[in-house]
């Protein structure tokens, strides 16, 4: 790393070493040899996150409802807006600036992991076994139903997106 | 009251590296910049870079970059200063010097040291 | 870097007298700037400030002035205790430099 001319949470400016505004705070003039550096506090929906020396407060984020958006956390004067999706949608990306309809996963494949407000539905085929005869963003691949407990016997077999059709046992005449 | 105490005088051949401990007492460690700073024979002082105990952060002089490492273990209250690759030219007692406390200054860098360590005398020689 | 440059490097004086030392500086550093004492031996010791704020502890004799490139320090009235090498340190922006030191000889 570079050497630095000044303190941590100071920066260099006429060949001096200046005070920079804490969060939430923008920079209005900077120091001179008399004065501390001037800053002042941001305005309603408006934040900065670090240390800085930035004249401009940056606005918070606006969680279009027209995109599927709402407001998860909502922004101070040191933190942005974090804004979510609707109930059955989720972010397109880490900024979450717009929202996409869950994935539901088709017939021979179930869920895996249900979507959440960032990501989406993660789906996996059915094994052998397992089955799901829907397209659901919910539903987990179903186990086989299995006719022997039932004191019965399979007639047609399973797919990955058909049960086992059970039936009665053939009785010895 | 205030005390830095350093470890002892080492005796290194020219290539190997040194450790010099720093341990403070009396005071909040965290609550103020460690700076090191040497003294070679019939030299005057030169300041070698600083460690903010806080943060773990330091600012090393362009001519030691590269060569010297400063950490800290704030369980104990001790600074460190690590210079490798020793020449006979790094003949010289080391100090740890305490600087004024984080907040204090809002202008200019303002390191004034008003405590010292003992220091320790490094010889390099083959 | 800046420049930190000390007249003279040596003075000869005797107990009583006034003894001025003078530091200049590359390019300005407004008014931080410091002096220490180091005896043989010794770490230095911080006596002035901010060019002329009196560490706590330091006797009144030791005074300090200027802001800029030019500072002084002033010792009023020499005492057997003050024979030593003193240095000046810019505290504008790192690096840190300090002025090559003045030695207060006995004459």
């Known amino acids: 790393e570079p050497p630095t001319a000044c303190r941590e949470k100071q920066y260099l400016i006429n060949s001096q070493c200046c005070s920079l505004c804490q969060p939430g705070q923008k920079l209005v003039s900077d120091c001179t040899e008399f004065t501390e550096t001037e800053c002042l506090p941001c305005g309603e929906s408006e934040f900065l996150d670090t240390w800085n020396r930035e004249t401009h407060c940056h606005q918070h984020k606006y969680c279009d409802p027209n995109l599927g958006l709402r407001v998860q956390q909502k922004g101070t004067s040191e933190t942005d807006t974090i804004c979510t999706c609707e109930e059955g949608w989720h972010c397109t990306s880490e900024a979450c600036e717009s929202c996409v309809l869950h994935r539901s996963c088709s017939p021979g494949f179930g869920v895996k992991q249900i979507a959440t407000g960032v990501s989406d539905t993660i789906c996996e085929p059915c094994p052998v076994g397992f089955f799901s005869n829907v397209s659901s963003a919910f539903e987990k691949c179903h186990p086989w139903t299995s006719c022997e407990t039932k004191d019965l016997v399979v007639q047609q077999a399973g797919t990955n997106k058909t049960d086992v059709v059970c039936g009665p046992q053939d009785r010895l005449r | 009251q205030v005390q830095l105490v350093q470890s002892g005088a080492e005796v290194k051949k020219p290539g190997a590296s040194v450790k010099v401990s720093c341990k403070a007492s009396g005071y909040t460690f965290t609550g103020y910049y460690m700076h090191w700073v040497r003294k070679a024979p019939g030299q005057g002082l030169e300041w070698m870079g600083w460690i903010n105990p806080d943060s773990g952060g330091t600012n090393y002089a362009q001519k030691f970059q590269g060569r010297v490492t400063m950490t800290r273990d704030t369980s104990i209250s001790t600074a460190y200063m690590e210079l490798n690759r020793l020449r006979s030219d790094d003949t010289a007692v080391y100090y740890c010097?305490?600087?004024?406390?984080?907040?204090?200054?809002?202008?200019?860098?303002?390191?004034?040291?008003?405590?010292w360590g003992q220091g320790t005398l490094v010889t390099v020689s083959s | 870097d800046i420049q930190m440059t000390q007249s003279p490097s040596s003075v000869s004086a005797s107990v009583g007298d006034r003894v001025t030392i003078t530091c200049r500086a590359s390019?300005?550093?407004?008014?931080?700037l410091a002096w220490y004492q180091e005896k043989p031996g010794k770490a230095p010791n911080l006596l002035i400030y901010?060019?002329?704020t009196l560490q706590s502890g330091v006797p009144s004799r030791f005074s300090g002035s200027g802001s800029g490139t030019d500072f002084t320090l002033t010792i009023s009235s020499l005492q057997p205790e003050d024979f030593a090498t003193y240095y000046c340190?810019?505290?504008?922006?790192?690096?840190?430099?300090f002025g090559g030191g003045t030695k207060v000889e006995i004459k």
């Open positions: 901010t060019a002329s």
């Open positions: 340190q810019q505290a504008n922006i790192f690096p840190l430099t």
């Open positions: 390019q300005g550093i407004y008014s931080w």
């Open positions: 010097a305490r600087d004024q406390p984080l907040g204090y200054c809002t202008n200019g860098v303002c390191s004034y040291f008003d405590y």
